[in-house]
């Protein structure tokens, strides 16, 4: 019993004054707690607790289930205990069959004895099976049998507590050991989509999948740079032993522009942590942004091909696309496709294939695209480069020689005089007048140039060459004339096209 020193509170005293008491089943348990500041008796066995506010605890007919620790507590919080065994040959064990063991830790098989004097208190495998060779245990009649350093391989091991009573082995009810694995790697986390683009008012929902060996992995959705607790819903499954999956779904039922940001799914266990992020962008309305992949002013040679290519961002999805030229819509020759097959893709490509372009097919080609919120367009100005064509070459009544040529880019007209029968006209002649004429054709068509020289300057027989040229090629026309005395003969023009 505790010694009393004046001025210092002491623990209560219990009668009978033993640490352990053995009574037979059916006998009376009578425990007296003496203390001026008595508060209560507490009884504990396995996970059950009972309280009694009387200072004398009386159980008239003791049962095996009255086996346990009886503790008396005073107002100073000091206590004293006695352990009572209620010996019942028909019930040697009290059991709590819940048996969970943490890998690499010790775990208690809770089968305390009702009789401390039985022998060979130990563990046995079910149906006569041997226990794993490396399984070590320590018996304690008041608590049960402690399995040392639980291994993952012991999972679902079937066990009995066992004692020898009068030379016979007696087994408890069976226990199934469930091993909780130790974390030996960080959780595996993944997210349903890496980025989300929404319009205001739409629902944002994103799922994080957490995989680990056990359900005691911790996980949460966090908003970066914010402490606000997010509303999330969990689904989870054990796909098998040591194969646990949780799906944490974060939902914002009506997203606002200021909900935009980075959301992190964070998971950790005792080994370490892992996280994955997703980005939410909320826009007040949809949009389309078009990016030409080639210059919007295009020069192409006559008879060649050109592809007009645009990339565009469209959110929500594009609904109508078309290519237009001269108020006519192309029904073929173009294709439109997403830039990637990714579910969150908002980038698309549209290509118009123009083949063997003629000089008359220059002009403005327009790409139009729309979605449920907006329309957008982009125009390409296509110029077809053509070799000059000499439209007219005449001697005018006023004695002028006139050459009119068309082509793109704008042709330059040079004049040459070839005296006599020479084939090479080298002496250049300066024009009297050069004009660029307005073409009657469509814009972006050929440009027409008119150039004139004064034939009176020529005093000898010969040929005059009108040469029209640009970046694409050149074309010539010739005027032949001869002198009879002082009179010029009729001039005979002819053309010679040079490649």
């Amino acid at each position: 019993q505790p010694s009393v020193s004046p001025g210092e509170p002491s623990p209560p005293s219990i009668h009978p004054g033993k640490s352990d008491l053995i009574v037979r089943v059916g006998d009376e348990i009578r425990l007296l707690c003496t203390d001026p500041g008595f508060v209560k008796w507490t009884f504990e066995i396995l996970d059950e607790t009972n309280e009694n506010k009387q200072n004398e605890w009386i159980t008239e007919k003791a049962e095996a289930t009255n086996t346990g620790k009886y503790t008396c507590t005073n107002k100073h919080g000091l206590s004293n205990s006695i352990y009572v065994f209620v010996r019942d040959p028909a019930k040697l064990f009290l059991v709590d069959r819940s048996l969970y063991g943490k890998e690499d830790n010790d775990t208690l098989v809770r089968c305390p004895l009702t009789d401390p004097e039985v022998t060979n208190y130990s563990l046995k495998g079910c149906q006569g099976k041997p226990l794993p060779k490396d399984l070590r245990f320590i018996p304690d009649p008041k608590a049960g049998i402690m399995i040392k350093s639980v291994k993952r391989a012991y999972h679902r091991l079937c066990l009995h507590c066992s004692v020898d009573q009068e030379g016979k082995s007696v087994l408890s009810e069976k226990f199934i050991l469930k091993v909780r694995p130790a974390f030996k790697a960080v959780p595996v986390v993944s997210v349903s989509k890496a980025s989300y683009l929404l319009r205001e008012g739409e629902e944002f929902t994103v799922t994080c999948t957490i995989k680990d060996v056990s359900s005691s992995v911790y996980s949460t959705w966090k908003r970066e740079n914010s402490q606000t607790k997010l509303q999330e819903k969990y689904n989870s499954w054990h796909h098998g032993d040591f194969n646990y999956e949780r799906q944490a779904t974060l939902t914002i039922s009506s997203a606002r522009v200021n909900d935009s940001g980075v959301f992190m799914c964070y998971a950790n266990n005792t080994f370490g942590s892992a996280n994955v992020t997703t980005t939410l962008e909320v826009v007040d309305k949809g949009f389309i942004n078009i990016f030409p992949m080639i210059n919007t002013t295009v020069f192409v040679n006559d008879g060649e091909n050109v592809d007009l290519i645009v990339e565009y961002e469209a959110f929500p999805k594009p609904e109508h696309q078309q290519w237009i030229y001269m108020n006519r819509t192309f029904t073929d020759k173009w294709e439109d496709y997403p830039k990637s097959e990714n579910e969150s893709n908002i980038r698309y490509v549209s290509e118009l294939h123009l083949t063997r372009l003629k000089g008359t097919e220059g002009g403005t080609y327009t790409f139009l695209v729309s979605n449920s919120d907006v329309n957008a367009a982009i125009a390409f100005n296509v110029y077809v480069n053509t070799k000059p064509e000499i439209l007219t070459y005449d001697r005018l009544v006023n004695g002028m020689l006139q050459c009119v040529a068309a082509g793109f880019p704008e042709p330059t007209i040079d004049w040459y005089f070839c005296p006599g029968t020479e084939q090479r006209c080298s002496a250049s002649v300066l024009p009297v007048d050069v004009q660029t004429l307005n073409s009657s054709g469509p814009p972006f068509g050929k440009l027409v140039v008119q150039s004139s020289i004064d034939s009176s300057a020529f005093k000898h027989n010969g040929t005059v060459e009108c040469k029209a040229y640009n970046d694409v090629g050149k074309t010539s026309a010739y005027f032949n004339f001869a002198f009879k005395g002082n009179n010029k003969e009729q001039i005979h023009p002819h053309t010679l096209f040079t490649p």
Partner: antibody, heavy 123, light 107 residues
């Protein structure tokens, strides 16, 4: 002995809220998850959600998300279930149940049940 | 969510009969299954946990078997006090779900 004692029957108006309590005794309160299950008249059992008394973590069935709140008071070993925006189909007996023989709310089973609380939603 | 399908929904039997109730999960749930008995006006009572472990105090005529997706509750010799409704429940993952129930009536 281990037991769960629930609060008495309630009659509530449409759109109102109800808060049912469940007082645990005879065991270590913080060691066991506590679930709520309801049963409409003549119907089967429907799991509503769970609270971990040791830390107060919760998980709810999707159906009740946003309408149900589960709390606990460790000083009185009591858990509470509050259901808001009551509808006529919420008329049911509500049970609290201890998750025994299990681990972190899985496996095992509900080994101890409260006696049930009848909640009637009237117009 | 994991769906639990119980069959039959009701059955009639006599005292002494052997009764079998089955429960099927929509996906594998290991042996994370419980069986409950409920009598009118009363709270459910746990009979079997972990698919086959008999709860303390439950008569040995009740037994459970199965793992993965198919489970069975067997009452080896039906007693008058066994006429009740029986429910299975999966405890493998959230949300936890119950079977629809099997009502055992007197023939």
């Amino acid at each position: 002995q281990v037991q769960l004692v629930q609060s008495g029957a309630e009659v509530k108006k449409l759109g109102a809220s109800v808060k049912v309590s469940c007082k645990a005794s005879g065991y270590t309160f913080s060691s066991y998850y506590m679930h709520w299950v309801r049963q409409a008249p003549g119907q089967g059992l429907e799991w509503m959600g769970v609270i971990n008394p040791n830390g107060a973590g919760t998980n709810f069935a999707q159906k009740f998300q946003g309408r149900v709140t589960m709390t606990r008071d460790t000083s009185t070993s009591t858990v509470y279930m509050e259901l808001s925006s009551l509808r006529s189909e919420d008329t049911a007996v509500y049970y609290c149940a201890r998750h025994g023989r299990g681990y972190e709310g899985y496996e095992g089973a509900f080994d101890i049940w409260g006696q049930g609380t009848l909640v009637t939603v009237s117009s | 969510d994991i769906q639990m399908t119980q069959s039959p929904s009701s059955l009639s039997a006599s005292v002494g009969d052997r009764v079998t109730i089955t429960c099927r999960a929509s996906q594998g749930i290991r042996n994370d299954l419980g069986w409950y008995q409920q009598k009118p006006g009363k709270a459910p009572k746990l009979l079997i946990y972990d698919a086959s472990s008999l709860e303390s105090g439950v008569p040995s005529r009740f037994s459970g078997s199965g793992s993965g997706t198919d489970f069975t509750l067997t009452i080896s010799s039906l007693q008058p006090e066994d006429f009740a409704t029986y429910y299975c429940q999966q405890l493998n993952g959230y949300p936890l779900t119950f079977g629809g129930g099997t009502k055992v009536e007197i023939k």
